[in-house]
């Protein structure tokens, strides 16, 4: 079934309460415009944002009978001429008579007649109508023939994009059959279709078709009021393409529209080939979009690649939410033109600072005021990390200007980084030289403490991403943060007693649930000694508060429980509810305190792994005193397992060479051999590839390496990812390796389709990557030797 037939069927369903063969139509209030009711329009009770009233009429082909409900009688079938009367197109019938067309459409043959309604003739320009009436045998006959096709074509045969030769000089009739059930012929809407005749079919249309001989290019070249657009099209080498065959829609800005542009903006764009071409192409659709087919907001891809939203408000057409079309449906032989009174500027033609919306004006105003805007050169590439207006508190805004400038510099990157370029673990450098970390979660992307909101855009010289909060790069390690805050003095002392201080000092990615001193309220010094006395128990308890990976509270999908494995080995349950982070259902007192090696969430209760039993009465008594939110299991005699700390050292091994090795020819018998065994290192990170976050597992096996040289004092392998310098480079003799990444798709950490759409806000269509597809990484120097 065609779209028209589907909508008609829906109208019939809506009208069946009124009797057989009754269709429900919706008429826009204050107009004569009627539409068969689609499901969407029926439930909205509106078309083009205007209220509608429901009318019940006989479905096409049926008629009422005196004293009977509905439309039980079928309309009489007649020849095309007679059918014009049946459908009420009496003016067209009269003109067919006087122009001597009557005998043709009463006789043999098969015709499709697109018959203008009586109202359509009334709306025709009076001079044109008079001209037709003054020359009925030629002009009027030609005009009517141009509404006819030499075979019967029902709406199901009127396919979208079809061009049918009319009976006047084979001039084309452009057919469009839209998903909302609207069928147009040269942009005139079929308002009553499929009235079968013995020698064809009649479709009533809402306007008189005017003859089309020109292309869009011809029209632009002839219209003085489009000279600016024409000149811009010439500059962008686009004018000729608008003379070629096609089904284009051109939203042509008038000269007045160009006058509305700030002169500086126009001068910049017109001086930039890429931007001016983008600007021009943004006004062109590769599909023919008649105004009559627009019954609600819809998004269309332009020739430039970005989309525009075309909507309607009553009789007006809006583009991107602004009423701007002042002349509709200028039909040409290769498309339709709508004249608009504003120039549409795509993001790709805008400077990065111009991409900011109403919600980021505080940021852009500050960037301008503090002299940072001038550093965003038109030919450079930047990324703005723009916090929303309400991220700027009064305290921030009243700061010393130099300090404020430093804060703003943290929100401008030296390079253009699009949304799809971001991946977990990525380090971004700001124009102020600060390094920012990227964290990618299931439904969020965060940079340091702040997470993105929808609205990322890419412009001519950069990209913009919108953030909930001001980005605050971390300055201190987890350990230093705890040390400078008196609230954590007890936890810190226990941490040190458990020999875990180093873990929170060295580089890494951790999430720490830090209990305040309130969590230890009532603990006596004897009980403290008891806890410290069992190192395994203490380590188990403390390491249950630590999770590998940085998990920012704002990055969690609201209301959903996230299960993380702690360093101790048991699971911890996190949930974001109303801007509050729940840790094992306990409310976090403060969250997202960023550090150089992780993030701290503050809790005022001690956490304990529910699956681990206690075997010591005294310890159980102490833990029950501190921990109320769970029932701790008691299994007499059970002990806490020792946690091998080596597992949690950073994967990157640093080799320190004490005393430079002397590389020279080794004589036999002089060789000192030391074998370094390397364990496989598995590194996981998430990268967004083609718009899809993919978890990448890099398995790097360190091979045994024999290092020779009589002068080596000793080699110490130490954990920690610091710089190893030239010594190491010499040492490894510039070994080059290839990294092969296994892309493991389809696991629970990936975004769902809907979430991708939500997160990537329709940027580029996401491409799925098949599981286990091998992606060859770049050649790189590796400290681990050859990777597998």
């Amino acid at each position: 079934n065609s779209y028209y037939d589907k909508v008609l069927a829906h109208s019939r369903i809506r009208g069946r309460d009124q009797g057989p063969n009754v269709c429900a139509l919706q008429q826009i209030l204050g107009t004569k415009k009627k539409y068969f009711s689609s499901c969407k329009n029926w439930y909205q009770g509106a078309i083009c944002g205007k209220k509608t009233t429901v009318l019940y009429e006989c479905c096409p082909g049926y008629m009422r009978m005196e004293g009977m409900k509905g439309c039980p009688a079928v309309m009489p079938i007649d020849h095309v001429y007679g059918t014009l009367g049946i459908v009420g197109a009496t003016t067209t019938q009269h003109y067919s008579d006087v122009s001597k067309l009557r005998e043709e459409i009463e006789g043999k043959g098969s015709y499709t007649y697109f018959a203008p309604s009586n109202e359509a003739w009334e709306n025709l320009d009076s001079d044109i109508r008079r001209g037709l009436e003054n020359n009925v045998n030629v002009e009027l006959l030609n005009a009517l023939h141009s509404h006819m096709v030499n075979k019967r074509m029902l709406t199901k045969d009127l396919k979208h994009g079809m061009v049918i030769p009319s009976m006047y000089n084979n001039l084309g009739l452009f057919i469009n059959h839209y998903p909302n059930g609207v069928v147009t012929v040269n942009c005139a809407r079929v308002i009553h279709g499929n009235q079968i005749a013995t020698n064809g079919v009649v479709h009533v249309i809402d306007r008189v078709l005017t003859q089309i001989g020109t292309s869009i290019q011809d029209f632009l070249e002839a219209e003085d009021d489009l000279s600016s657009f024409r000149a811009a099209a010439i500059t962008s080498d686009l004018l000729e393409s608008l003379g070629r065959d096609g089904h284009f829609t051109l939203f042509a800005p008038t000269n007045e529209a160009f006058e509305k542009l700030p002169r500086g903006v126009l001068e910049r764009i017109m001086g930039d080939k890429v931007a001016s071409e983008a600007l021009m192409k943004y006004h062109i659709l590769n599909t023919l979009q008649c105004s009559e087919a627009i019954t609600g907001g819809a998004v269309f891809e332009t020739m430039e690649g970005n989309t525009i939203e075309i909507g309607c408000e009553g009789d007006s057409i809006s583009i991107n939410g602004i009423k701007m079309v002042n002349k509709k449906d200028i039909v040409t032989k290769n498309g339709v033109i709508h004249l608009i009174d504003e120039v549409l500027i795509p993001d790709s033609a805008k400077q990065v600072i111009e991409l900011a919306g109403k919600q980021q004006t505080t940021f852009t105003d500050l960037v301008a005021q503090l002299g940072l805007a001038s550093s965003l050169k038109p030919d450079g590439e930047y990324t703005l990390l723009a916090p929303v207006n309400n991220a700027f508190s009064d305290d921030t805004l009243s700061m010393d200007q130099r300090l404020l400038k430093l804060i703003l510099q943290n929100h401008i990157l030296k390079v253009k980084v699009g949304l799809s370029d971001l991946y977990n673990g990525q380090i971004l450098e700001t124009i102020g030289g600060k390094q920012l970390r990227v964290f990618v979660y299931r439904t969020a992307i965060c940079i340091e403490n702040s997470c993105m909101v929808r609205g990322s855009k890419q412009g001519r010289n950069g990209a913009i991403h919108i953030f909930r909060e001001i980005i605050q790069p971390a300055e201190k390690s987890l350990h230093d943060k705890l040390r400078q805050d008196k609230r954590f003095s007890i936890f810190l002392s226990l941490l040190e007693a458990a020999d875990l201080k180093d873990l929170l000092t060295q580089p890494g990615d951790w999430t720490l649930f830090a209990p305040t001193n309130d969590a230890f309220k009532g603990m006596t010094s004897e009980e403290r000694e008891l806890l410290i006395g069992d190192k395994n128990a203490l380590q188990n308890i403390i390491l249950y508060h630590l999770t590998p990976g940085v998990y920012i509270g704002k990055g969690f999908e609201p209301g959903v429980t996230n299960i993380l494995k702690t360093t101790q080995g048991s699971k911890i349950y996190l949930k974001g509810v109303n801007e509050t982070l729940l840790v094992n259902e306990l409310k976090s007192k403060e969250s997202d305190i960023m550090t150089t090696n992780g993030v701290i969430h503050v809790v005022d209760k001690l956490l304990y792994p529910a699956d681990i039993p206690v075997g010591n009465d005294q310890l159980l008594e102490l833990l029950n005193k501190l921990i109320k939110y769970i029932q701790i299991k008691f299994v007499r005699g059970s002990t806490f397992k020792e946690i091998p700390m080596t597992v949690y050292r950073p994967a990157m091994t640093k080799i320190q060479i004490e005393g430079d090795p002397d590389f020279r020819l080794i004589k036999e018998g002089e060789t000192v051999t030391e074998v370094i065994h390397g364990e496989p290192v598995i590194k996981k990170y998430t990268k967004i590839i083609d718009g899809v976050p993919v978890e990448i597992t890099e398995k790097q096996t360190r091979e045994e390496r024999i290092i020779t040289g009589p002068e080596i004092k000793y080699t110490r392998i130490s954990t920690g990812g610091g710089e190893t310098g030239e010594t190491l480079q010499k040492f490894l003799q510039k070994e080059v390796s290839k990294v092969t990444k296994f892309i493991e798709g389809g696991d629970g950490h990936l975004f769902e389709d809907e979430e991708i759409k939500r997160l990537l806000q329709g940027d580029t269509p996401a491409k799925k990557i098949p599981a286990n597809k091998r992606v060859q990484g770049p050649r790189r120097r590796s400290r681990e030797g050859r990777s597998q």
Epitope: N255, E256, L261, R263
Partner: antibody, heavy 118, light 110 residues
Framework: QVQLVQSGAEVKKPGASVKVSCKAS????????ISWVRQAPGQGLEWMGW????????NYAQKLQGRVTMTTDTSTSTAYMELRSLRSDDTAVYYC???????????WGQGTLVTVSS | QSVLTQSSSASGTPGQTVTVSCSGS????????VNWYQQLPGTAPKLLIY???QRPSGVPDRFSGSKSGTSASLAISGLQSADEADYYC???????????FGSGTKVTVL
């Protein structure tokens, strides 16, 4: 063909005002703007400002803001430029030019010499 | 004092190529397009090149424009005696919000 015809030469005293006219023909007047450019004797060109013939919107050079007024009369397809509080350094040939913005100053008037002298 | 800097004169013999240069800053040429005007002695200026390299209809293809960074140039090939004129570059200046012209270059055909 497109033509811009300007009014004749003027001699003015310092402190006085001058109003130069520019009559357009050969195109749709309201579809284009008009810019005014002046050239002091033996000197280069200086842009004074622009007016939309469609709606009368103006954009004046900062230097002349407050002293210059540009207007149009669509019924006669004529643009006007009035300069007040004339000084001797305002002595110049004043040109009007059709300005469609995308193609700036594509047709020029023949120029009007304004001499400011006491 | 013009915002855009042009060499005061340039010359060549008939048939030669002469290049006129125009130097600006990031707020004018660096950010915006450059247009060129020809002013024959005793006449009004005439648009020669717009949008860096576009010739209006009627301008011979012996005239060509280009722009790079904060500089622009106009090349006149196959120099003719009729090309003897003053040539002005012009651009919009973002910082002044004004259309600025160069000081002009007098081209002489020897």
């Amino acid at each position: 063909q497109v033509q811009l015809v300007q009014s004749g030469a003027e001699v003015k005293k310092p402190g006085a005002s001058v109003k130069v006219s520019c009559k357009a023909s050969g195109y749709t007047f309201t579809s284009y703007g008009i810019s005014w450019v002046r050239q002091a004797p033996g000197q280069g060109l200086e842009w004074m400002g622009w007016i939309s013939a469609y709606n009368g919107n103006t954009n004046y050079a900062q230097k002349l803001q407050g002293r210059v007024t540009m207007t149009t009369d669509t019924s006669t397809s004529t643009a006007y430029m009035e300069l007040r509080s004339l000084r001797s350094d305002d002595t110049a040939v004043y040109y009007c030019a059709r300005d469609m913005l995308v193609v700036p100053f594509d047709y020029w008037g023949q120029g009007t010499l304004v001499t400011v002298s006491s | 004092q013009s915002v855009l800097t042009q060499s005061s004169s340039a010359s060549g013999t008939p048939g030669q190529t002469v290049t006129v240069s125009c130097s600006g800053s990031s707020s004018d040429i660096g950010s915006n397009r450059v247009n060129w005007y020809q002013q024959l002695p005793g006449t009004a200026p005439k648009l020669l090149i717009y949008s860096n390299d576009q010739r209006p209809s009627g301008v011979p293809d012996r005239f060509s424009g280009s722009k790079s960074g904060t500089s622009a140039s106009l090349a006149i090939s196959g120099l003719q005696s009729a090309d003897e004129a003053d040539y002005y570059c012009a651009a919009w200046d973002d910082s002044l919000s004004t259309y600025v012209f160069g000081s002009g270059t007098k081209v002489t055909v020897l």
